[in-house]
Interface confidence: low
Amino acid sequence: SGVFQLQLQEFINERGVLASGRPCEPGCRTFFRVCLKHFQAVVSPGPCTFGTVSTPVLGTNSFAVRDDSSGGGRNPLQLPFNFTWPGTFSLIIEAWHAPGDDLRPEALPPDALISKIAIQGSLAVGQNWLLDEQTSTLTRLRYSYRVICSDNYYGDNCSRLCKKRNDHFGHYVCQPDGNLSCLPGWTGEYCQQPICLSGCHEQNGYCSKPAECLCRPGWQGRLCNECIPHNGCRHGTCSTPWQCTCDEGWGGLFCDQDLNYCTHHSPCKNGATCSNSGQRSYTCTCRPGYTGVDCELELSECDSNPCRNGGSCKDQEDGYHCLCPPGYYGLHCEHSTLSCADSPCFNGGSCRERNQGANYACECPPNFTGSNCEKKVDRCTSNPCANGGQCLNRGPSRMCRCRPGFTGTYCELHVSDCARNPCAHGGTCHDLENGLMCTCPAGFSGRRCEVRTSIDACASSPCFNRATCYTDLSTDTFVCNCPYGFVGSRCEFPVGLPPSFPW
């Protein structure tokens, strides 16, 4: 089964005359009749054994014929056949003039024929068009033709039936010769057998569709090559289905008993050492300064009140430190200070006794400083100017000459970064090479000192006798700096009346 297709392309009848030589009035309104028949050595009249077809009026005198296959199938002309194509044919094409609208043969005058051509030959099935041109004395016809198979017919003679399908009975398309070509993922004579996912385990997996890998009971994974462990197996694996071989550190039938609590839960805090001591049992060995089951509690060495004579205790990483009140010194503020009799003032400093000789003060000459006038005032020795600033001594004071781009008393501010005062709550802004840094006042933290971090222990004014109060941020406690004449952790005792401590 197939179709002989004839594509009319151009008809030339410049003088607009009939085959008899008589002119058409007003012009030759031309249509065509086509007859397809079996091969004849000399094409003669008789039945059109392979089929016949007529066109409507396609033009007047000379015209090109539009390809109209999309608009109803008029050109190319279709001559279907439902037998094996023999490979040879005869073709007769007649051009007729239609004086009126009735194109039936009996309705036309016998001399309405414009031209008639007849060809014969061999023609193989194929997609390529054969182009031909036939010329008579007065007319010329250009056309092309071919034979193609109908849907589902294949082979050299359109005799092989093959219908593509994609269902339970097969998954294939048809090759040009009519043989089956399996769709991707299918195999077998009729392409009914799915090709499983590449690598799907032969014994443990199977498939009902291509690229699928369905697992048999006891197996899992994309390729069904992983066994399923025993139901309830928590921390274990298997090499065959339903096993439960415990991972390191786990035990029990379902591998749910924790034999390595230290590794799995890291319960010990603050750098303590963890030791497993049985199922879900462990012991923490604390670093100095920590206590508790998990070493979660910080020991405070100030708890034993080691500072004497009203000294204030401050916890430090490596122990503690006593802040002694005026008149006392030593690790625990256990020593009283020198008196003027000891000539403590250097560099010509004058000694003045205080509090009935209990302590003293040095009045230093110009250019010397320190509690004993032991330091020369060279305000530039400590390189106070940041960011390459130049330090200049100006008598009793100093000044910093800053490099371009920096400002502030110590050239510590980068003009561009710190100019917009980014540090909150009175934080000090420092310019760095790639940004800025805020040094926050007590009680605040964060990149811009925006986070309030502690309670101000000095807020309740705990120091007496006009002492200066300082907040110790590490412990949220306060330290009182006593004026002359007062001692005690709150400067509450006059020097003349020392407190009675129980030691």
């Epitope: 697992c215 899992q220 069904c224």
Partner: antibody
Framework: QVQLVQSGAEVKKPGASVKVSCKAS??????????ITWVRQAPGQGPEWMGW????????NYAQKLQDRVTVTTDTSTSTAYMELRSLRSDDTAVYYC?????????????????WGQGTMVTVSS | QSVLTQPPSASGTPGQRVTISCYSS??????????VYWYQQLPGTAPKLLIY???QRPSGVPDRFSGSESGTSASLAISGLRSEDEADYYC????????????FGGGTKLTVL
């Protein structure tokens, strides 16, 4: 019982992108045994399949009409799947669901979309 | 590509038996080539798997729900209809054309009168 919990509702402007998450409760081993499919449902419409990912090996498959705009991924360490849709249009307004898929199947008792997330409403409006 | 067509609505009275059909058309029009899945969606909730592989019921789904297929159509039957069965029902199937994708039917709104 495994549950799928999705991220909250989103309101986006046309041309923007949205990323919806879908977290599976249960163990890592459970999560990687399955695929996650994403389905959306416009108001008053039926469900539309968007795409699928295997949590086992990361293989993906997308609906042809969305494949230039959608990406699905998984993070097996958190048992979470993600769906990102780019170049949003007003007709992308829908409830987006994740569902557990049968691929790879272990064993053959589990089936397509047997567990669904609660859905995430995505509204695209200028 | 395949298209799954469902009737937009169906109805029945309590105790009655109701059937919802799902027709396949397109490049893979023989629905028998693929497994059909049915989902129930109650208002404001996610769909719920009702039937898988044409006629299999997940645990927890009452045996009042059953599925079948023949040729180009599949059916969901609900016997002993109850008021709580009022919902949208969707069929779905995996279509192997192109690179493979899931196709959902347009849904059937079941009303219990």
């Amino acid at each position: 019982q495994v549950q799928l919990v999705q991220s909250g509702a989103e309101v986006k402007k046309p041309g923007a992108s949205v990323k919806v998450s879908c977290k599976a409760s249960g163990t890592y081993r459970t999560f990687t045994n399955y695929g996650i499919t994403w389905v959306r449902q416009a108001p008053g419409q039926g469900p539309e399949w968007m795409g699928w990912i295997s949590a086992y090996n990361g293989n993906t498959n997308y609906a042809q009409k969305l494949q230039d705009r959608v990406t699905v991924t998984t993070d097996t360490s958190t048992s979470t799947a993600y769906m990102e849709l780019r170049s949003l249009r007003s007709d992308d307004t829908a409830v987006y669901y994740c569902a557990r898929d049968r691929v790879p199947r272990i064993p053959v008792t589990t089936e397509a979309f047997d567990i669904w997330g609660q859905g995430t409403m995505v509204t695209v409006s200028s | 590509q395949s298209v799954l067509t469902q009737p937009p609505s169906a109805s029945g009275t309590p105790g009655q038996r109701v059937t919802i059909s799902c027709y396949s058309s397109g490049s893979s029009s023989n629905i028998g080539s693929y497994f059909v899945y049915w989902y129930q969606q109650l208002p404001g909730t996610a769909p719920k798997l009702l039937i898988y592989r044409n006629n299999q019921r997940p645990s927890g789904v009452p045996d009042r729900f059953s599925g079948s297929e023949s040729g180009t159509s599949a059916s969901l039957a609900i016997s002993g209809l109850r008021s709580e069965d009022e919902a949208d029902y969707y069929c779905a199937a995996w279509d192997d054309s192109l690179s493979g994708h899931w196709v959902f039917g347009g849904g059937t709104k079941l009303t219990v009168l």
